[in-house]
């Protein structure tokens, strides 16, 4: 919290920035419709002014939609609402008789649209273990819309793998919703060598969808488990 | 004109689940984030949860972590708030409120403000 | 977390009264306070953002100031329409927390 400092009227000073360490980073995205504030917190004697610029030109009020804030008292500006026309270099400049400084921010607005669900790669990951032991497969998705998560098995149907149509016999062994939870896990308790096979993570949200899949590998007792490496 | 609608409240014995709907209008609702704050009768103001409507992150209060979840649907501009092993102590008006970020460049973190609020949906938790 | 603390809990006062209300943070929250309105039986309406920043539609009557960990809600001239009660609010740290509560009443 910088505010104004009162100095002795006779160490006369140009200005200064009070911490220019937190001034290192200059680009910045920000998404759109939120607001941005910008602070030069500076010292001086006299105490210096502030103005600002965008874009190496005098920033006026009447330059976006809303214009914008300043309290002087800490040193910032903001602006409410940003649409990607406020991108630009901000520039503030602070002054007095004795010197003048200046700090410019890089503003980038981006706008977010919603995508299809994205994957962590590697997840499921492949995992081997005892008949009679636990395995976990976890599933990371990022998803802007509501995901829906389905773990599904390919199973057989009267020895085959395959029905009459061509495709493969499969089974939604657990999905999102009210009565699951956590449905980025499967949980597999006291596995048989029925068990064995590939599990896939297949989510969807109402743009589109993604899977990834991992292997089970069931091992007799006397073998001892692993993780496999990807 | 931006409105916020909560519903789904009502009566539930302790251990039960309620799941509250926040359905938005009026904003481009994957921009901003939406926040849960619930009122205890005759009490104070209590920040449950927000979540991000961008990415879909979440931060939870301590007393209702690993109980409550908190999702969004973008399709329907709806916020959900997941309520399970419900006590007493989360007897309320739950209130939904959309929430922006004022981003300070200078200081590298974000403040969540809380601009529109819903008119708030009663939960009562009492066997 | 961090604590914050409003007083008076409660004050009363009459229409045209200068009226001030001040909320104490346990730790530096920099500038990351807000400050509520709320009647009965309604849900809250945001007045400052960022200790002093007037949100839009907000009556210039309101005005916040301070930073660090004092800070103050003034109300110039009190309207009939103000007397509700009125919450800070800090962001800084996780979790948000608010203050008790200032309730303001007609004398």
């Known amino acids: 919290a910088e505010d104004f400092v009162s100095e002795n009227s006779n160490n006369k000073r140009a200005p200064y920035w009070t911490n220019t360490e937190k001034m290192e980073k200059r680009l910045h995205a920000v998404p759109a419709a939120n607001t941005v504030k910008f602070r030069c917190p500076a010292g001086g004697n006299p105490m210096p002014t502030m103005r600002w610029l965008k874009n190496g030109k005098e920033f006026k009020q009447e330059h976006r939609i809303g214009g914008y804030k300043v309290r002087n008292q800490h040193w910032s500006l903001i602006m409410e609402s940003v649409v990607p026309s406020d991108k630009g270099n901000y520039t503030c400049v602070v002054e007095n008789e004795y010197g003048s400084i200046n700090h410019t921010y890089h503003l980038d607005v981006v706008e977010r649209s919603p995508h299809r669900p994205i994957l962590q790669a590697g997840l499921p990951a492949n995992a081997s273990t005892v008949v009679g032991g636990d395995v976990e497969f976890v599933c990371k998705v990022y998803s802007d819309a509501q995901p829906h998560i389905q773990w599904i098995k390919h199973v057989e149907k009267n020895g085959s793998k395959y029905g009459p149509d061509g495709l493969p016999y499969l089974k939604v062994l657990k999905h999102s919703g009210i009565n699951s939870s956590n449905a980025e896990v499967l949980a597999l308790f006291n596995v048989t060598e029925a068990d064995a096979g590939e599990y896939i993570c297949k989510v969807s949200n109402y743009i589109g969808q993604a899977n990834q899949s991992a292997w089970l590998t069931v091992l007799p007792k006397q073998q001892a488990p692993g993780r496999e490496k990807e | 004109e931006v409105q916020l609608v909560e519903s789904g409240g009502g009566l539930v014995q302790p251990g039960g689940s309620l799941r509250l709907s926040c359905a938005a209008s009026?904003?481009?609702?994957?921009?901003?984030?939406i926040s849960w704050v619930r009122q205890a009768p005759g009490k104070g103001l209590e920040w449950v949860g927000r979540?991000?409507?961008?990415?879909?992150?979440?931060n939870y209060a301590d007393s209702v972590k690993g109980r409550f979840t908190i999702s969004a649907d973008t399709s329907k501009n709806t916020a959900y708030l997941q309520m399970n092993s419900l006590r007493a102590e989360d007897t309320a008006v739950y209130y939904c409120?959309?929430?922006?970020?004022?981003?300070?460049?200078?200081?590298?973190?974000?403040?969540?403000?809380?601009?529109?609020w819903g008119q708030g949906t009663l939960v009562t938790v009492s066997s | 977390d961090i604590q914050m603390t409003q007083s008076p809990s409660s004050l009363s006062a009459s229409v045209g009264d200068r009226v001030t209300i001040t909320c104490r943070a346990s730790?530096?929250?920099?500038?990351?306070l807000a400050w509520y309105k709320q009647k009965p039986g309604k849900a809250p309406k945001l007045l400052i953002y960022?200790?002093?920043f007037l949100y839009s539609g907000v009556p210039s009557r309101f005005s916040g100031s301070g930073s660090g960990t004092d800070f103050t809600l003034t109300i110039s001239s009190l309207q009939p329409e103000d007397f509700a009660t009125y919450y800070c609010?800090?962001?800084?740290?996780?979790?948000?927390?608010f203050g008790q509560g200032t309730k303001v009443e007609i004398k």
């Open positions: 009026g904003f481009t609702f994957t921009s901003t984030g």
């Open positions: 960022s200790a002093s």
């Open positions: 609010q800090q962001s800084t740290g996780h979790p948000q927390t």
């Open positions: 730790q530096d929250v920099d500038t990351s």
């Open positions: 409120a959309r929430t922006y970020g004022i981003y300070d460049l200078y200081v590298d973190y974000t403040e969540y403000v809380m601009d529109y």
């Open positions: 979540t991000h409507l961008g990415d879909g992150s979440t």
